[in-house]
């Protein structure tokens, strides 16, 4: 057992927040400022992530964990660990390479990110349009015309004419 212990890597005793310092006879030294080690037995500490520009600090770096970033208002995270910040658009718009673009007629987006998607086609489910769609909201489907009691009128307003293109706001 003693022999096994002596063969063991002395660096394995260094806890998170420290590194095994080869320059100091493999003793465990604390991570320098702005660096961290999240696991034990590390020979170096990793540099802390810096949340600059459009990134802002969500969680400060500590000796045992990296900083975490999110995005400044008007942007949202993209990619694991918020590796990028992407511009928000308004509801009723989608982000393109050329910036925010209004949803085309017949499509909507109820979020500040993502792509405008087509309105639900109520007739595919044998239903009628109860509330017309907008750029920000999907249509609301109601009962099929046959389901309406005799004499009851459908609340479906007439379908709007094709809108002209909107310029982005």
């Amino acid at each position: 057992f003693e022999r096994t212990r002596s063969l063991q890597d002395p660096c394995s005793n260094c806890p998170a927040g420290t590194f095994c310092d080869n320059n100091r006879n493999q003793i465990c030294s604390p991570c320098p400022p702005n660096s961290f080690s999240s696991a034990g037995g590390q020979r170096t500490c990793d540099i802390c992530r810096q949340c600059k520009g459009v990134f802002r600090t969500r969680k400060e770096c500590s000796s045992t964990s990296n900083a975490e970033c999110d995005c400044t208002p008007g942007f949202h995270c993209l990619g694991a660990g918020c590796s990028m910040c992407e511009q928000d658009c308004k509801q009723g718009q989608e982000l393109t390479k050329k910036g925010c673009k209004d949803c085309c007629f017949g499509t909507f987006n109820d979020q500040k990110r993502g792509i405008c998607r087509p309105w639900t086609n109520c007739s595919l489910d044998g239903k009628s349009v109860l509330v017309n769609g907008t750029k920000e909201r999907d249509v609301v489907c109601g009962p099929s015309p046959a389901d309406l009691s005799p004499g009851a009128s459908s609340v479906t307003p007439p379908a709007p004419a094709r809108e002209p293109g909107h310029s982005p706001q």
């Epitope: 993209l78 990619g79 694991a80 590796s83 990028m84 982000l95 390479k97 050329k98 910036g99 993502g114």
Partner: antibody, heavy 119, light 111 residues
């Protein structure tokens, strides 16, 4: 380099379901790109099926929306497509592909997997 | 849905020829001076390969004999001097709105 490998194709009975997989290597599917599926019936053109973004928002072909489910498993770096109530006209080569950060065009494609729907 | 119509459906050409393929959209795929249209090349038994995006931008690694032009509803893919490896089927794709749609394809055959 980005590599996409589809699997799960084969012979399926009409009315059945199938789940296709697309294993990505050389790139993380949790990077922020959109990922999608496109199919091609024998001797025919390309048909766009679905997209999924980093947040898990899903976008489908209007005509196939009720029968398609796109999903992803970031831990396995794999994209999936489930297609239900299969018909003979679903016979096609199914491709997965990487799009850009806007879900527009497709810059990397898998080699495709053939699905044959027949009794 | 935006329909894309390619013409011709097929064409025969010789090595060295200048080849032009057109793609017409049922409505404009432009926004703020930008055209949301791509071109792909597909060879038999292979996956499509991106050639051109944003109507005229050449994808990295694609030979300069390929070029794209057009705006609004009318777009063109030009191969300035056809090479043996260019015999394939070419597709346009719009990404102005969902659902994304492809043209029906143009097959370029050896004369």
């Amino acid at each position: 380099e980005v590599q996409l490998v589809e699997s799960g194709g084969g012979l399926v009975q009409p009315g059945g379901s199938l789940r296709l997989s697309c294993a990505a290597s050389g790139y993380s599917i949790s990077s922020g790109h959109y990922w999608g599926w496109i199919r091609q019936a024998p001797g025919k053109g390309l048909e766009w099926l679905a997209l999924i973004d980093w947040y898990g928002d899903k976008y489908y072909s209007t005509s196939l929306k009720s029968r398609l489910t796109i999903s992803r498993d970031n831990s396995k770096n794999t994209l999936y497509l489930q297609l239900n109530s299969l018909r003979a006209e679903d016979t096609a080569v199914y491709y997965c592909a990487r799009s850009d950060y806007y879900g527009s065009h497709f810059d990397y494609w898998g080699q495709g997997t053939l699905v044959t729907v027949s009794s | 849905d935006i329909q894309l119509t390619q013409s011709p459906s097929s064409l025969s050409a010789s090595v060295g020829d200048r080849v032009t393929i057109t793609c017409r959209a049922s409505e404009s795929v432009d926004f703020d001076g930008f055209s949301f249209l791509a071109w792909y090349q597909q060879k038999p038994g292979k996956a499509p390969k991106l050639l051109i995006y944003d109507a005229s931008n050449l994808e990295t690694g694609v030979p300069s004999r390929f070029s794209g032009s057009g705006s609004g509803t009318d777009f063109t893919l030009t191969i300035s001097s056809l090479q043996p490896e260019d015999f394939a089927t070419y597709y346009c794709q719009q990404y102005d709105t969902l659902p994304r749609t492809f043209g029906q394809g143009t097959k370029v055959e050896i004369k």
